[in-house]
């Protein structure tokens, strides 16, 4: 992890990097590696992509072990093929208001994505896209046969917008905080970021936190009950310790993770909180990192990686952080 030892590189030839990712010397000047990209974890040995103006932000001087690849102050953003200046706000579509800050984009939804539970007035609630309307709206399908009252269908669950209002006014500052982005990894340790000006100087700043939607080694499909298609929040059998680039959390955590579905839906964090976690490294150094902890998950068809970059961005976000 650090550069104190002699150079030791893998025997294979230099790695092949994905398109747009630079092949660079590691931070020790030893081996050629694929540069880490914006928002990825970085170390002294795993440097960030210098050709994109990225540097490894360790957060505080005490945490010189593991950082997050961050754009230099004032770096522009490329979003949907358009370049935006740092500090510039833009409407990426009728559904989202976004802000570029030092190479990172944070977006806030403009559409309410409420959830509706069945009732006598609306036994079969559905969200639909109406012609000429940007935001989806609720429609209430009446039972096909009005004389038969069937069981109420489960609420059509897209995404909730419950939790604190992201916009409030405080002492000449319109406080704005974007949602936490989805975790950068669908399993294992990743990064989630947001942009906020909720600070004493009312200046936009980026915040990041570690996140783990589910462990990579977990075979969750085995736990799905017979006749069911999903396991939303699997029961955790034993407390675990988190690992981060060779460092281990000092405490054990009975953390919740999101499950899986067998019918094409994906399960993602729905309500989360942010807590500090202390990691102890092999050399005895202790570092504190903020980490996402899952309260509840939701299973839905709005899975990440779909064609519409706005949709995947929007539906992957986590709302209602209760830190």
């Amino acid at each position: 992890q650090n550069c104190s030892g002699p150079c030791r590189c893998p025997d294979e030839p230099a790695p092949r990097c994905p398109a747009g990712v630079s092949l660079v010397l590691d931070g020790c000047g030893c081996c050629r590696v694929c540069a880490k990209q914006l928002g990825e974890l970085c170390t002294e040995r795993d440097p960030c992509d210098p050709h994109k103006g990225l540097f490894c932000d360790f957060g505080s001087p005490a945490n010189r072990k593991i950082g997050v690849c961050t754009a230099k102050d004032g770096a522009p953003c490329i979003f949907g093929g358009t370049v935006y200046r740092s500090g510039e706000s833009f409407q990426s579509s009728c559904k989202y208001q976004c802000t570029c800050l030092d190479g990172a984009v944070g977006c806030m939804p403009l559409c309410s994505m409420d959830v509706r539970l069945p009732s006598p007035d609306c036994p079969f609630p559905r969200r639909v896209k109406l012609p000429g309307k940007c935001c989806e709206e609720w429609v209430c399908d009446e039972p096909k046969d009005q004389t038969v009252v069937g069981p109420a269908l489960a609420a059509y669950r897209l995404e909730d917008t419950f939790g604190p209002d992201p916009t409030m006014i405080r002492a000449n500052c319109l406080v704005q905080t974007t949602e936490w982005s989805a975790c950068s990894k669908t399993c294992g340790m990743g990064i989630s970021t947001r942009v906020t000006n909720d600070n004493a100087s009312c200046r936009l700043e980026k915040q990041s936190r570690l996140c783990m939607v589910r462990p990579c080694e977990a075979d969750l499909e085995e736990n799905i009950k017979k006749g069911k298609k999903c396991i939303r929040t699997p029961k955790i059998s034993k407390p675990i310790k988190f690992e981060l680039s060779g460092c281990t959390s000092m405490k054990t955590y009975r953390a919740k993770f999101c499950g899986v579905c067998t019918d094409g839906r994906c399960c993602t964090p729905h309500r989360t909180t942010t807590l500090p976690v202390e990691f102890k490294c092999p050399d005895g150094e202790v570092m504190k990192k903020n980490m996402m902890f899952i309260k509840t998950c939701a299973c839905h068809y709005n899975c990440p990686g779909d064609n519409d970059i706005f949709e995947s961005l929007y539906y992957r976000k986590m709302y209602g952080d209760m830190a």
Epitope: D114, L117, S119, D121, C122, P123, V149, A152
Partner: antibody, heavy 114, light 110 residues
């Protein structure tokens, strides 16, 4: 963010008419119905009335002759009037959104006394 | 007059399971009663937990589940947490009106 807020007089004299307003935000009254519920001190909840998304209304039969519920969708307001108030009507009055009674207002306490 | 009856109080230990029920005086509760469960924690506003018999609100933890059990509406809490201590009300729909139960005061020991 979905919110409901009740407003109205704190003190009402016996035989007078109580008018309560529920002002909502974060959803449309053309999409969701709104219920009125009350809770007398130390007692259980009591359902009073509902105005549905399409404007239809239903009432608790015990109060039907005394209650009227209406809405102004453009103002996002639902109004409940209760005539011939009596000291036994002293309670905290709540409005709640239809659909699992998912969101409630904080309630407004009404005392009926001469 | 239709009466909806709930257990006045129940006590459970943390981590335990408890079932709150909601009985109708005019027969078995069915899905057409659209059973709702509402929670009020001390000093907090009411909020809906379950609607339409078994549908959870977005903020309702997975340990809460709504069902029909033996002709009654039921709210089952498995793996009870200290923060689940609250008053729970059920409400049933009867074609033209709702009726609330008397409420169950759930106490979590410890």
């Amino acid at each position: 963010e979905v919110t409901l807020k009740e407003s109205g007089p704190v003190l009402v004299k016996p035989t007078e008419t109580l008018t309560l307003t529920c002002t909502v935000s974060g959803f449309s009254l053309s999409t969701f119905g709104v219920h009125w519920i009350r809770q007398p001190p130390g007692k259980a909840l009591e359902w009073l009335a509902v105005i549905w998304r399409r404007g239809g209304t239903d009432y608790n039969a015990a109060f039907m002759s005394r209650l009227t519920i209406s809405k102004d969708t453009s103002k996002s307001q639902v109004v409940l009037t209760m005539t011939n108030m009596d000291p036994v009507d002293t309670a905290t009055y709540y409005c709640a959104r239809d659909g699992g009674f998912d969101y409630w207002g904080q309630g407004t306490t009404v005392t009926v006394s001469s | 007059e239709t009466v909806v009856t709930q257990e006045p109080s129940l006590t459970v230990s943390p981590g335990g399971t408890v079932t709150l029920t909601c009985r109708s005086s005019i027969g078995a509760v069915t899905t057409s009663n659209y059973a709702n469960w509402v929670q009020q924690k001390p000093g907090q506003a009411f909020r809906g937990l379950i609607g339409g018999t078994s549908n959870r609100a977005p903020w309702t933890p997975a340990r809460f589940s709504g069902s029909l059990l033996g002709g009654k509406a039921a709210l089952t809490l498995s793996g009870v947490q200290p923060e689940d201590e609250a008053e729970y009300y059920c409400a049933l729909w009867y074609s033209t009106h709702y009726v609330f139960g008397g409420g169950t005061k759930l106490t979590v020991l410890g």
